[in-house]
């Protein structure tokens, strides 16, 4: 906390500028008046404050908006943003997607921060949905967002929003959150011919179950063994090994170095050692010839 | 202990550019900024600017706009004064200086590098 | 830009000798720093904020002064204390420097 004192003869700030520099901190707290700092909040990015200038700059303002800063002054608070705790972070309402992205471009190549956590929740609680431009804009930020979300989150995103998705957003993701993600991108994506449509939901497809597993394989899709690889195992298990030869198309040939990886073992496991060997990559523990196979669970279910 | 390591000497052609670094260590180097002075031939000191490593801004004093570019690199934590369109007067011995919290001066100082303009 | 004026330029003193010099400053500054150099060697902070001793400075030394008048004494001058003392302004943008005052040993 700066001690009060008068602002010295002549000392009197008529504007923001770089004459502040070398103001000390009980000067720019007697001397500086906060309205005028918070009508030219855009300078302060230009001058070479010191970090603890930038904390006085900050108390200014704390005073002036007790209840939390209005969005003109949050859109030009630049460095100054990097000062403010999730608690400070609470007490606003950003609405403009500039603001937004005015703030995150302060953070850029930083890690995701509280502060900018915080921000981004307040913002998506505030359009009351994760729409296509806030998507598109947080993702370019930081690729990894959308994984950032729970399930419940993520069930607020409208199938709209998903065109925004790339492959790479969706590098974290863990199959609950695709789970939520491949009904809605199947949802955006289903007027796309065959091709294009897959292109564009295999990113997704961690999130699909046994039966559209079984319609891509009709397709001549020729999925790479990286996206099978990704594949809910409960989704793989009950295909067939003609249904995943033709799933995979030449990729077919990459199964052998992930037989003792899943979902790849376990589907090895539920197949007759018959039809695997038709595919004539030497993939080993199958169902031996002659045996019968019981699916318990389907039994259960019946009971 | 803080130490400001700065480049050997030049000689350079006048017309041409050079540009001298001062590496940091010791501290945490975006917490305080950087300032270059220039002393020519053991007369007085005369203020460059300042620079804040952590955001890159700058301020310089007016007689060197134009005439000094700082600039910073926060991951090698060393800050660099570019002189360009050099002329005989800009010969001098140019420190790189710590500034200090709450503006207590230049409480540290590089050992300077002398810059020598000459055909 | 603020001027700041330093006398004398150069004054020699007595090994036990008070000795004091001063700077004036165009305008109205808030603070004064004092800075000592030695030949061949850079600057070293003396006396910052006007009146306070940097780390290692003897307590002999002393920095007052206020407005567009400071000075920096030594109570009793010793042979290490021979240098050039420069003043420096802490307030108006940009920073700037007195020529110096060089104190010899007699």
């Known amino acids: 906390e700066v001690e009060k004192t008068a602002c010295p003869s002549g000392k009197k700030a008529p504007e923001i500028d770089e004459s502040l520099i070398f103001y000390k901190k009980w000067e720019l707290e007697a001397c500086v008046d906060a309205a005028l700092l918070a009508t030219q909040m855009d300078r302060v990015n230009a001058i070479p404050f010191t970090y603890e200038q930038l904390d006085v700059l900050k108390h200014k303002l704390d005073e002036l908006y007790p209840q939390g800063y209005p969005e003109s002054v949050i859109q030009h608070l630049g460095y100054l943003f990097l000062k403010m705790s999730p608690e400070d972070i609470r007490k606003w309402n950003v609405t403009s997607l500039e603001t937004l992205k005015a703030l995150l471009e302060v953070n850029k190549g930083h890690e995701m921060s509280p502060q900018v956590a915080t921000l981004i929740d307040r913002f998506v609680k505030g359009r009351g949905q994760l729409d296509k431009d806030t998507l598109d804009t947080l993702t370019a930020f930081y690729p990894g967002y959308l994984c950032s979300l729970s399930p419940e989150e993520l069930s607020s995103v409208p199938p709209s929003s998903i065109w925004a998705v790339r492959p790479q957003d969706l590098d974290t993701c863990d199959p609950r959150q695709l789970d939520v993600l491949y009904p809605k991108a199947r949802l955006a994506f289903q007027n796309m011919n065959g091709s294009e449509y897959f292109v564009k939901i295999q990113s997704f497809l961690g999130g699909a179950p046994t039966e559209d597993l079984k319609a891509l394989s009709q397709q001549n899709v020729s999925m790479d063994l990286a996206t099978f690889m990704k594949l809910r195992t409960d989704a793989v298990l009950p295909l067939t090994v003609a249904e995943v030869q033709k799933l995979l198309g030449p990729h077919v040939e990459g199964l052998k170095a992930e037989e003792r990886h899943r979902p790849v073992r376990d589907w090895i496991l539920r197949q007759r050692q018959d039809d695997l060997d038709t595919l004539g990559l030497g993939l080993q523990g199958g169902i031996p010839n002659g045996y019968l196979v019981l699916d318990l669970s389907m039994q259960e279910a019946l009971s | 202990q803080v130490q400001l390591q700065q480049s050997g000497p030049e000689l350079v052609k006048p017309g041409a550019s050079v540009k001298i670094s001062c590496k940091a260590s010791?501290?945490?180097?975006?917490?305080?900024?950087m300032n270059w002075v220039k002393q020519s031939n053991g007369k007085s000191l005369e203020w460059i600017g300042v620079?804040?490593?952590?955001?890159?801004?700058?301020s310089y004093n007016q007689k060197f706009k134009g005439k000094a570019t700082i600039t910073a690199d926060t991951s090698s934590n060393t800050a660099y004064l570019q002189l360009s369109s050099l002329t005989s007067e800009d010969s001098a011995v140019y420190y790189c200086?710590?500034?200090?919290?709450?503006?207590?001066?230049?409480?540290?100082w590089g050992q300077g590098t002398l810059v020598t303009v000459s055909a | 830009d603020i001027v700041i004026t330093q006398s004398p330029a150069i004054m020699s003193a007595s090994p036990g000798e008070k000795v004091t010099m001063t700077c004036s400053a165009s305008?109205?500054?808030?603070?004064m720093h004092w800075y000592q150099q030695k030949s061949g060697t850079s600057p070293k902070r003396w006396i910052y904020d006007t009146s306070k001793l940097a780390s290692g400075v003897p307590a002999r030394f002393s920095g007052s002064g206020s407005g567009t008048s400071y000075s920096l004494t030594i109570s009793s001058m010793e042979a290490e204390d021979a240098a050039t003392y420069y003043c420096?302004?802490?307030?108006?943008?940009?920073?700037?420097f007195g020529a110096g005052t060089k104190l010899e040993i007699k």
């Open positions: 620079i804040n490593p952590n955001y890159g801004t700058t």
């Open positions: 305008s109205s500054v808030s603070y």
């Open positions: 200086a710590k500034g200090d919290y709450d503006g207590a001066g230049f409480a540290y």
């Open positions: 420096q302004q802490w307030s108006s943008n940009p920073l700037t």
């Open positions: 010791g501290y945490s180097f975006t917490d305080y900024n």
